[in-house]
């Protein structure tokens, strides 16, 4: 659980301000597994990397939160970062 959370935080902290903004916008429409809801837009847009990590983990649990984060990174063209995140999660 701690490893996945740290991996998410590490990935989000490596995004530029512009990329973090784009990440949040893509997170609002990313396809979700059945049974999961969306983080409310209002809360999401003002969050920094640390708050967003905590919200992802509390909303989706650490494992799915990491998978979802990786998918949004891939949607942004950041496949290498996504791969590193998933590798760190599965160590």
């Amino acid at each position: 659980m701690g490893r996945a959370r740290d991996a998410i935080l590490d990935a989000l902290e490596n995004l530029t301000a512009e990329e973090l903004k784009k990440f949040k916008l893509k997170l609002l429409s990313v396809p979700l597994r059945e049974g999961y809801g969306r983080i409310p837009r209002g809360a999401l847009l003002s969050m920094d990397a640390l708050d967003l990590t905590d919200k992802l983990v509390s909303f989706y649990a650490a494992t799915y939160g990491a998978e979802l984060t990786a998918n949004v990174l891939r949607d942004m063209g950041l496949q290498e970062m996504a791969g590193q995140l998933q590798a760190a999660t599965h160590q």
Epitope: K26, S29, V30, P31, N71, R74, D75, M76, G77, Q79, E80, G83
Partner: antibody, heavy 114, light 107 residues
Framework: QVQLQQPGTELVKPGASVKLSCRAS?????????????LEWIGNINLSNGRTNYN??FRAMATLTVDKSSSTAYTQLSSLTSEDSAVYYC?????????????WGQGTSVTVSS | NIVMTQYPKSMSLSIGERVTLRCKAS??????VSWYQQKPEQSPKLLIY???NRYTGVPDRFTGSGSATDFILTITSVQAEDLADYHC?????????FGAGTKLELK
């Protein structure tokens, strides 16, 4: 419909270089297609921040750059051989999810011949 | 690198037939597969992305399915304008890779 503008043809000598251009936006990919063959991804560049990714196969011969002021992506192909005679496409990823290549230029046909 | 294997290499068919094109990834790529149509002397055109999402303006006779390593493009009733090369590609990992293509020809 977004139109990606690419010049039509380039004739270059073996060992020489060529710089291909593409008016584009967002992530711009470069894709090689030899006559009668499949598609090969060379690399991509993000026009807003200059971030690049390369296919290792092409890293030594392709250099991707961008001119933000004109929204133009470039690939410089160097030390060309006959194997590099191909159509080179630029393509954009504009769909919000799954990172497909949804807009393609008409391609630049590069012929390497003495 | 992820290898995308397409089969068959070519298919001869009659107008109105149902066609199934297959693409197999050498490792799990989730749903990060797209299908492209390419007619002679033209650029590729996006048909399907995210394995099953039809791109804007693509006729509903084109359907994509599959996930992980096995993907299918189905054309329910082939029209003359569908005779072309079809490429699958993955965007899960760099380098992005494509299959060798399947050519649809008239019988």
């Amino acid at each position: 419909q977004v139109q990606l503008q690419q010049p039509g043809t380039e004739l270059v000598k073996p060992g020489a270089s060529v710089k291909l251009s593409c008016r584009a936006s967002g992530w711009t990919h470069w894709v090689k297609q030899r006559p009668g063959q499949g598609l090969e991804w060379i690399g991509n560049i993000n026009l807003s921040n200059g971030r690049t990714n390369y296919n290792e196969k092409f890293r030594a011969m392709a250099t991707l750059t961008v001119d933000k002021s004109s929204s133009t992506a470039y690939t410089q192909l160097s030390s060309l051989t006959s194997e590099d005679s191909a159509v080179y496409y630029c393509a954009n990823s504009m769909v919000p999810h799954f990172f497909p290549m949804d807009y393609w230029g008409q391609g630049t046909s590069v012929t390497v011949s003495s | 690198n992820i290898v995308m294997t397409q089969y068959p290499k070519s298919m001869s068919l009659s107008i109105g037939e149902r066609v199934t094109l297959r693409c197999k990834a050498s490792e799990n790529v989730g749903s990060y597969v797209s299908w492209y149509q390419q007619k002679p002397e033209q650029s590729p055109k996006l048909l399907i992305y995210g394995a099953s999402n039809r791109y804007t303006g693509v006729p509903d006779r084109f359907t994509g399915s599959g996930s992980a390593t096995d993907f299918i493009l189905t054309i329910t009733s082939v029209q003359a304008e569908d005779l072309a090369d079809y490429h699958c590609g993955q965007s899960y990992n760099y380098p992005l890779t494509f299959g060798a293509g399947t050519k649809l020809e008239l019988k």
